[in-house]
Interface confidence: low
C-alpha cells in the first residue's frame, strides 16, 4: 500500500512483497526488501525508533537506495504495519503483517503490564480498547469488571478490528474499573492485557465573571476580575484571558481550584486577573475562556476606564411621566457617571424622604399614585469625589379615569310620573377630561330581576341589551344636551344631561364616560308610573326626633288597595342608583307598614306617620296600588333621608381687635348644627340689644357696630344654641382715641 502524495520526480518506494496484508506463521523469518530513488528508512511495530535488536535492516548488495528488513523467528507481537519511506518526506509504502501465533493472539503492549483507557460519559462517544490482534479474523469479546460483563460485537456500535482494537460506546464501560479483550480459538480462551478505565469529565456547566457587568474605574485604580468555572467531576480546566492591553506590566493572573462541599457533584475553578493601575488603554472587552479539552465556555464583560470622576444625565432621562391614579410610578434617575452619584429627589422644591408610600432612591417609586402627586420632580446628582452637581426636572402628570359624581350620592329610586319631562345628569371628573360621554338605555322589564343572571355588587344590573339613546324605538323620546363644563368643589367637571321628553316607559339609563385611561359608568333607574304620587309633609328632609308624614295619593276611580311598604335589607349591598326595579315584582323584600286612609272628592290618600323620626327610619318607602280593572300592581318609591342631630359648632374664631372711635366694626359668627342653632350676641356677658349703632343681620350671624364709641369697648361673645346645647366664641374689642364732646354736653 502506498502512503503520501507522489512528488513530481519521485516514485513510491517498491516493496519485494507486493501485498497490502501479509500473513505468516510464528517462528518463521520475515524478510522484506525496499527499493527507491533516494535514501530509505524502515519503521515497524512496537519500536518506531529502529533500536530493536531482533530486527535487522541491511543495505542491499545489488544496488543503491535499497534496504532489507529481516526479523528471524517472528512472534505474535511483531504483527503490525511495516513502512518503508524516503527520509524527510511523506512518501512511503506500507505492508500490514499478521504473525499468526495462536498461543498469543493479542499483541502485547510495550509495558506488558496493563494499559489505561480514558473515557467520558458522553452517550455519543465511543472508546477504543487497543487490543490489536496478530490474527485478523478472531472472535473477540470485551470483558469488563466489576461486576463482570461481556460485550460482543454487534455489527453496529460495538466492533473489533485487528488493526485498531475493540470499539464500544464509552458509557457502557464507565462503571467498570478494568477491561480486557478475550479471543476464543479452538475452545481455548486467550486474554489481552488488562486496561484500567479512567472516567474523565469534560462538562463545563458555566463560566461566571465577577463583577459581571457595569465595571467602571478611573485611571490609576486597580481592576480585579474573577472568572469561576463550574464543572462536573474529573475535569481539568485551562483558563485563557483576552483583554485590550496585552502588554500590561502590572497584570497578574492566578488560577486555583476552589473547595466544594463534600458529596458535591461539581468542581469549581477560579482564575483571577488583576491589573494594579489601569490606564485608558485597558478599557474594553475582557473575555475569560475555560476549556476542558472537549468543551470550551467563555464569558465577557466590558470594563470602562474614565479619565476622571464625572456625572451627567443619560439620554433616556424622561422629562414627562404620565400615570393613572392607583398605579405604581417608577421614575429612574438615568445617569452616566463615575463613581455612582448621590441621588436626591425634590418635589416642587421640597426634599422627598422615603416612607411607605414613596421610595426616593436610584428610582423614584410612588407606590399608589394619586392626583396630589402631580407636579415637578427635581432629581439632583452629586459626584461623591468631585462634588459636581447635575439637576433634571421631571413633570409627573397623573390621569384620573372617569369618576361619576352622582355615583357617590345615595341615589333616589323615586318613580317618575307618566308623561312628564325629566332630566338625568352625569357629572364626570376625569383627567384628561372625557373624550366622550355616551348614554345608553334598556327597557326595565328586560333587565330587573333577571333569573338567569346572578346579580353582583359590581354588576347589580344584569342587563345584556344596552341600546344607544339614538335608537329609542320602544323607549322614551330622548335628547342629549351638549356637555357643559363646571367648576365643582374646585375641580373642572364635565356635566352631561339627558332630557327625557315624555316619561312613557320604565327603563334604565346608563351614562358611560371614557377618557384615555379608562371608563366610568352610572346606571339610573327610571321607573315610570301612571299611578299614585308620594309627597312628604312637612319637609323633604326631616331631622331625627322630628315628625314626618308620607302621603300616597291615588285616583279612587282607577286604583284600590293602597298599601305602604318599606324596602327591607337586600341580599347584596345595593350601590348607588343600583336598585333593581320595579319593586312591585319582588314583594319579598318589602315590609308592610301601618298607615291611615282618608278620602277627598277624587282621591284616596294613605298617610304613613313617622313620629320622632330616627336614623333607622331612613330608606326607601314604597306605595303600592292596584288597578281596579286589570288588578295590575303599581308601585311608587320615595327615598326618605333623616338628617342626624348635630350639636352646634361655630366655625372660625372671633379676633380681638383695636378700632378707633368713629370707625365701624364688622364681625361674623357662622354656626352649624342640626337643628340649626339660634345665634345670640353678648357684651360683657349681657345680651346685646340692637339700636341705631348696633345692627344684627342674617339670623344674627353678622354684627355691625357703626361709629364706635368708647363705651362699645368690651368682651363680645357669640353664642349658638339649639336643643342639643350651646357653643360660644369671644373677642375683646379695644376702642382708641378721645371721645369728642357733643353739643349736648
Amino acid at each position: 500500500a502506498s502512503v503520501g502524495l507522489p512528488s513530481v520526480s519521485l516514485d513510491l518506494p517498491r516493496l519485494s512483497i507486493q501485498k497490502d496484508i501479509l500473513t505468516i506463521k510464528a517462528n518463521t523469518t520475515l524478510q522484506i526488501t525496499c527499493r527507491g530513488q533516494r535514501d530509505l528508512d524502515w519503521l515497524w511495530p512496537n519500536n518506531q525508533s529502529g533500536s530493536e535488536q531482533r530486527v535487522e535492516v541491511t543495505e542491499c548488495s545489488d544496488g543503491l537506495f535499497c534496504k532489507t528488513l529481516t526479523i528471524p523467528k517472528v512472534i505474535g507481537n511483531d504483527t503490525g504495519a511495516y513502512k518503508c519511506f524516503y527520509r524527510e518526506t511523506d512518501l512511503a509504502s506500507v505492508i500490514y503483517v499478521y504473525v499468526q501465533d495462536y498461543r498469543s493472539p493479542f499483541i502485547a503492549s510495550v509495558s506488558d503490564q496493563h494499559g489505561v483507557v480514558y473515557i467520558t460519559e458522553n452517550k455519543n462517544k465511543t472508546v477504543v480498547i487497543p487490543c490489536l490482534g496478530s490474527i485478523s479474523n478472531l472472535n473477540v469479546s470485551l470483558c469488563a469488571r466489576y461486576p463482570e460483563k461481556r460485550f460482543v460485537p454487534d455489527g453496529n456500535r460495538i466492533s473489533w478490528d485487528s488493526k485498531k482494537g475493540f470499539t464500544i460506546p464509552s458509557y457502557m464501560i464507565s462503571y467498570a474499573g478494568m477491561v480486557f479483550c478475550e479471543a476464543k480459538i479452538n475452545d481455548e480462551s486467550y486474554q489481552s492485557i488488562m486496561y484500567i478505565v479512567v472516567v474523565v469529565g469534560y462538562r463545563i456547566y458555566d463560566v461566571v465573571l465577577s463583577p459581571s457587568h457595569g465595571i467602571e474605574l478611573s485611571v490609576g485604580e486597580k481592576l480585579v476580575l474573577n472568572c469561576t468555572a463550574r464543572t462536573e467531576l474529573n475535569v481539568g480546566i485551562d483558563f485563557n484571558w483576552e483583554y485590550p492591553s496585552s502588554k500590561h506590566q502590572h497584570k497578574k493572573l492566578v488560577n486555583r481550584d476552589l473547595k466544594t462541599q463534600s458529596g458535591s457533584e461539581m468542581k469549581k475553578f477560579l482564575s483571577t486577573l488583576t491589573i494594579d493601575g489601569v490606564t485608558r488603554s485597558d478599557q474594553g472587552l475582557y473575555t475569560c475562556a475555560a476549556s476542558s479539552g472537549l468543551m470550551t465556555k467563555k464569558n465577557s464583560t466590558f470594563v470602562r476606564v474614565h479619565e476622571k470622576p464625572f456625572v451627567a444625565f443619560g439620554s433616556g432621562m424622561e422629562s414627562l411621566v404620565e400615570a393613572t391614579v392607583g398605579e405604581r410610578v417608577r421614575i429612574p434617575a438615568k445617569y452616566l457617571g463615575y463613581p455612582p452619584p448621590e441621588i436626591k429627589w425634590y418635589k416642587n422644591g421640597i426634599p422627598l424622604e422615603s416612607n411607605h408610600t414613596i421610595k426616593a432612591g436610584h428610582v423614584l417609586t410612588i407606590m399608589e399614585v394619586s392626583e396630589r402627586d402631580t407636579g415637578n420632580y427635581t432629581v439632583i446628582l452629586t459626584n461623591p469625589i468631585s462634588k459636581e452637581k447635575q439637576s433634571h426636572v421631571v413633570s409627573l402628570v397623573v390621569y384620573v379615569p372617569p369618576q361619576i359624581g352622582e355615583k357617590s350620592l345615595i341615589s333616589p329610586v323615586d318613580s317618575y310620573q307618566y308623561g312628564t319631562t325629566q332630566t338625568l345628569t352625569c357629572t364626570v371628573y376625569a383627567i384628561p377630561p372625557p373624550h366622550h360621554i355616551h348614554w345608553y338605555w334598556q327597557l326595565e322589564e328586560e333587565c330587573a330581576n333577571e333569573p338567569s343572571q346572578a346579580v353582583s355588587v359590581t354588576n347589580p344590573y344584569p342587563c345584556e341589551e344596552w341600546r344607544s339613546v339614538e335608537d329609542f324605538q320602544g323607549g322614551n323620546k330622548i335628547e342629549v344636551n351638549k356637555n357643559q363644563f363646571a367648576l365643582i368643589e374646585g375641580k373642572n367637571k364635565t356635566v352631561s344631561t339627558l332630557v327625557i321628553q315624555a316619561a312613557n316607559v320604565s327603563a334604565l339609563y346608563k351614562c358611560e364616560a371614557v377618557n384615555k385611561v379608562g371608563r366610568g359608568e352610572r346606571v339610573i333607574s327610571f321607573h315610570v308610573t301612571r299611578g299614585p304620587e308620594i309627597t312628604l309633609q312637612p319637609d323633604m328632609q326631616p331631622t331625627e326626633q322630628e315628625s314626618v308624614s308620607l302621603w300616597c295619593t291615588a285616583d279612587r276611580s282607577t286604583f284600590e288597595n293602597l298599601t305602604w311598604y318599606k324596602l327591607g335589607p337586600q341580599p347584596l349591598p345595593i350601590h348607588v342608583g343600583e336598585l333593581p326595579t320595579p319593586v312591585c315584582k319582588n314583594l319579598d323584600t318589602l315590609w308592610k307598614l301601618n298607615a291611615t286612609m282618608f278620602s277627598n272628592s277624587t282621591n284616596d290618600i294613605l298617610i304613613m306617620e313617622l313620629k320622632n323620626a330616627s336614623l333607622q327610619d331612613q330608606g326607601d318607602y314604597v306605595c303600592l296600588a292596584q288597578d281596579r280593572k286589570t288588578k295590575k300592581r303599581h308601585c311608587v318609591v320615595r327615598q326618605l333621608t333623616v338628617l342626624e342631630r348635630v350639636a352646634p359648632t361655630i366655625t372660625g374664631n372671633l379676633e380681638n381687635q383695636t378700632t378707633s372711635i368713629g370707625e365701624s366694626i364688622e364681625v361674623s359668627c357662622t354656626a352649624s348644627g342640626n337643628p340649626p342653632p339660634q345665634i345670640m350676641w353678648f357684651k360683657d356677658n349681657e345680651t346685646l340689644v340692637e339700636d341705631s349703632g348696633i345692627v344684627l343681620k342674617d339670623g344674627n350671624r353678622n354684627l355691625t357696630i357703626r361709629r364706635v364709641r368708647k363705651e362699645d369697648e368690651g368682651l363680645y361673645t357669640c353664642q349658638a344654641c339649639s336643643v342639643l346645647g350651646c357653643a360660644k366664641v369671644e373677642a375683646f374689642f379695644i376702642i382708641e382715641g378721645a371721645q369728642e364732646k357733643t353739643n349736648l354736653e
Epitope: E445, E446, E450, P451, S452, Q453, P462, E464, E465, F472, Q473, G474, G475, N476, K477, A502, N504, V505, R530, T630, K632
Partner: antibody, heavy 113, light 111 residues
Framework: EVQLVESGGGLVKPGGSLRLSCAAS????????MNWVRQAPGKGLEWVSS????????YYADSLKGRFTISRDNAKNSLYLQMNSLRAEDTAVYYC??????WGQGTLVTVSS | QSVLTQPASVSGSPGQSITISCTGT?????????VSWYQQHPGKAPKLMIY???NRPSGVSNRFSGSKSGNTASLTISGLQAEDEADYYC???????????FGTGTKVTVL
C-alpha cells in the same frame, strides 16, 4: 347586510310537531331580541313569540302558551320555534324578525289531515 | 289577546294623500310612543316604514309619515304612487300580558 333565513316548514298532521329554524347573519345576533310572527293565508300579521338576547325573557301570545317553545343558540346565530300539538288554525307563513325592523322571507307551515 | 283596529281598505288616486288609522287603548297605542307601521306586498315579507310613532328608517321615502293622538295612531302617505299599493299593518308595545300587538291590516289601493 342583515339576513334572516327561515327553514323547517312543511305539511304536518293535526297533533303533530314541527321545529322551525332561523339562520341569522350580517349582525351581532347575540345582542338582539328576536321574534316570530305568523300570517295565516289571506289574513293579517299575528305576533307569536319573543326572546331576549340572553334568553332571559320569553313571551308568547296567550293563545299559544304551552304548545310553542322559542329558543336560540347564540353560538350558532340561530333562532328556533318548537311547535307541538299543531292545529289547523296554526297554518300560516311563519316569519322570523329582529326588532321588527328586519324580517326573513318566511316558511310555510300547513297543518292538515 | 286584543288587536289594534285598522280600516279594512283605503284607496286614493296617484298624487293624492291618504291616511290610515290604528286605534288601540291606553295600554298600548295611548300608553306608549311605540307605534310602528309595516308595508307588505303580496307574497313578500313585511317592511318597516315608521317606528316610534313618527320616525322613518333610512331608505324609506319621506312621503310616509306617522303621528298619534290619544289612543289612535295614523300613517299618512302623500303623493300616492302605484308602488304604494300594498297591505299596511300597525303594531304597538302593550302593557298587557304580552308585549306586542298588531293591527288588523289595511289594503291600500291606488286607483
Amino acid at each position: 347586510e342583515v339576513q334572516l333565513v327561515e327553514s323547517g316548514g312543511g305539511l304536518v298532521k293535526p297533533g303533530g310537531s314541527l321545529r322551525l329554524s332561523c339562520a341569522a347573519s350580517g349582525f351581532t345576533f347575540s345582542s338582539y331580541s328576536m321574534n316570530w310572527v305568523r300570517q295565516a293565508p289571506g289574513k293579517g300579521l299575528e305576533w307569536v313569540s319573543s326572546i331576549s338576547s340572553g334568553s332571559s325573557y320569553i313571551y308568547y301570545a296567550d293563545s299559544l302558551k304551552g304548545r310553542f317553545t322559542i329558543s336560540r343558540d347564540n353560538a350558532k346565530n340561530s333562532l328556533y320555534l318548537q311547535m307541538n300539538s299543531l292545529r289547523a288554525e296554526d297554518t300560516a307563513v311563519y316569519y322570523c324578525a329582529r326588532d321588527f325592523g328586519n324580517w326573513g322571507q318566511g316558511t310555510l307551515v300547513t297543518v292538515s289531515s | 289577546q286584543s288587536v289594534l283596529t285598522q280600516p279594512a281598505s283605503v284607496s286614493g288616486s296617484p298624487g293624492q294623500s291618504i291616511t290610515i288609522s290604528c286605534t288601540g287603548t291606553s295600554s298600548d297605542v295611548g300608553g306608549y310612543n311605540y307605534v310602528s307601521w309595516y308595508q307588505q306586498h303580496p307574497g313578500k315579507a313585511p317592511k318597516l316604514m315608521i317606528y316610534d310613532v313618527s320616525n322613518r328608517p333610512s331608505g324609506v321615502s319621506n312621503r310616509f309619515s306617522g303621528s298619534k293622538s290619544g289612543n289612535t295612531a295614523s300613517l299618512t302617505i302623500s303623493g300616492l304612487q302605484a308602488e304604494d299599493e300594498a297591505d299596511y299593518y300597525c303594531s304597538s308595545y302593550t302593557s298587557s300580558s304580552t308585549p306586542y300587538v298588531f293591527g288588523t291590516g289595511t289594503k291600500v289601493t291606488v286607483l
